[in-house]
């Protein structure tokens, strides 16, 4: 008998997954930028806002050159999972002032979930370690006031914007190494 029948190709391979992750990240970055601009129009920010429960920015321009595939993907996945939790929290506890942004926040959440699935698929296909988030999950209590939820939204969108910005650069750099 001849060799056994092969398997048909599945829909994508790791390099295509990485391309897809770059496109999804770019698209999410554009959405976040647009939503942050809407927030600034509706609720002008008085300076920079921060939230202790948000992840610290993983990368700076100086560290981009030394990036390694596992580290970037693991850190990006953990940080995006944190931002996903924060977006879910905003939608749930943001109060009436943020209700007008509900369709956009819902779309942002769906895109974030899709990107996370793509990153996990890529890590599985490459057989890279997929550590669970090692930092304890900080319970997110309700915002102290309507203004508190607006400040939180500014902080979340601002942080997500910066994270996605380095993610696009990092993923593009990793493409050359796969």
């Amino acid at each position: 008998p001849g060799p056994p029948a092969g398997s048909p190709r599945v829909s994508s391979d790791p390099r295509a997954d990485l391309d897809s992750a770059v496109l999804l990240t770019r698209s999410l970055l554009a959405d976040t930028r647009q939503l942050a601009a809407q927030m600034r129009d509706k609720f002008p920010a008085d300076g920079d806002h921060s939230l202790d429960s948000l992840p610290t920015l993983a990368m700076s321009a100086g560290t981009l050159g030394s990036l390694q595939l596992p580290g970037v993907l693991t850190r990006l996945r953990v940080d995006l999972m944190s931002y996903l939790r924060h977006v879910q929290w905003l939608r749930r506890a943001g109060g009436p002032s943020l209700k007008t942004l509900e369709p956009e926040l819902g779309a942002l959440q769906a895109r974030l979930e899709r990107l996370l699935r793509r990153l996990q698929l890529l890590m599985s296909r490459l057989a890279l370690p997929q550590a669970a988030p090692d930092q304890p999950v900080i319970p997110l209590g309700p915002p102290a006031s309507a203004w508190g939820s607006i400040r939180a939204a500014h902080a979340i969108l601002g942080g997500l914007h910066l994270t996605l910005d380095w993610a696009v650069r990092g993923l593009l750099l990793l493409k050359t190494r796969l």
Epitope: P14, S124, R125
Partner: antibody
Framework: EVQLLESGGGLVQPGGSLRLSCAAS????????MHWVRQAPGKGLEWVAV????????YYADSVKGRFTISRDNSKNTLYLQMNSLRAEDTAVYYC???????WGQGTLVTVSS | QSVLTQPPSASGTPGQRVTISCSGS?????????VHWYQQLPGTAPKLLIY???ERPSGVPDRFSGSKSGTSASLAISGLRSEDEADYYC???????????FGGGTKLTVL
């Protein structure tokens, strides 16, 4: 078309050794993590070991840790499993699988018996 | 004892819809790890049926669909056919193993 072809199975005595090979074709082998998964007769699937696309990460199921070694040669598009100190409970069909796993070979039977 | 729990058997008549469940824990499926489904026809190697909870590889009919919620996932097969008679396995990444874990498998019988 993707092909994964296992070889090296056979009958071995308890305490003995075997080396399984898996020849890959039809896809970019060096871009995929590779697994060994086994299936004892009449039982379910049990993950055995995985090696990352570039060979830098290797992980094993507790049941084979310290006895089995997974390795790969990307220049030859080949995956290996060195099995030492074999036990009766290692008797199974051993599948080589790529990716999620997305692709599976047809398997090779390893029988450990005296 | 599998880390992911599946019913050992399921059955249905041609044309029917059947669902197979896969229950995990907060350390695998509940931690955001995706679920994949495999079909193993008698005497053959497993074949990827659903990946990333709900995605179908090319060539898999749209009668097969997957979903995930919380710590569990399910595979639905609509318009059941005799050729669907097989063993079905779910799998998910388990960070404590740094590898995938498989469910115990569900034997589907088409009556």
């Amino acid at each position: 078309e993707v092909q994964l072809l296992e070889s090296g199975g056979g009958l071995v005595q308890p305490g003995g050794s075997l080396r399984l090979s898996c020849a890959a074709s039809g896809f970019t082998f060096s871009s995929y993590g590779m697994h060994w998964v086994r299936q004892a007769p009449g039982k379910g699937l049990e993950w055995v070991a995985v090696i990352s696309y570039d060979g830098s990460y290797k992980y094993y199921a507790d049941s084979v840790k310290g006895r089995f070694t997974i390795s790969r040669d990307n220049s030859k598009n080949t995956l290996y499993l060195q099995m030492n100190s074999l036990r009766a409970e290692d008797t199974a069909v051993y599948y080589c699988a790529a990716g999620v796993p997305d692709y599976w070979g047809q398997g090779t039977l390893v029988t450990v018996s005296s | 004892q599998s880390v992911l729990t599946q019913p050992p058997s399921a059955s249905g008549t041609p044309g029917q819809r059947v669902t197979i469940s896969c229950s995990g824990s907060s350390s695998n499926i509940g931690s955001g790890y995706d679920v994949h489904w495999y079909q193993q026809l008698p005497g053959t190697a497993p074949k990827l049926l659903i990946y990333s909870n709900e995605e179908r590889p090319s060539g898999v009919p749209d009668r097969f669909s997957g979903s995930k919620s919380g710590t569990s996932a399910s595979l639905a097969i609509s318009g059941l056919r005799s050729e669907d008679e097989a063993d079905y396995y779910c799998a998910a990444w388990d960070p404590s193993l740094s590898g995938p874990v498989f469910g115990g498998g569900t034997k589907l019988t088409v009556l």
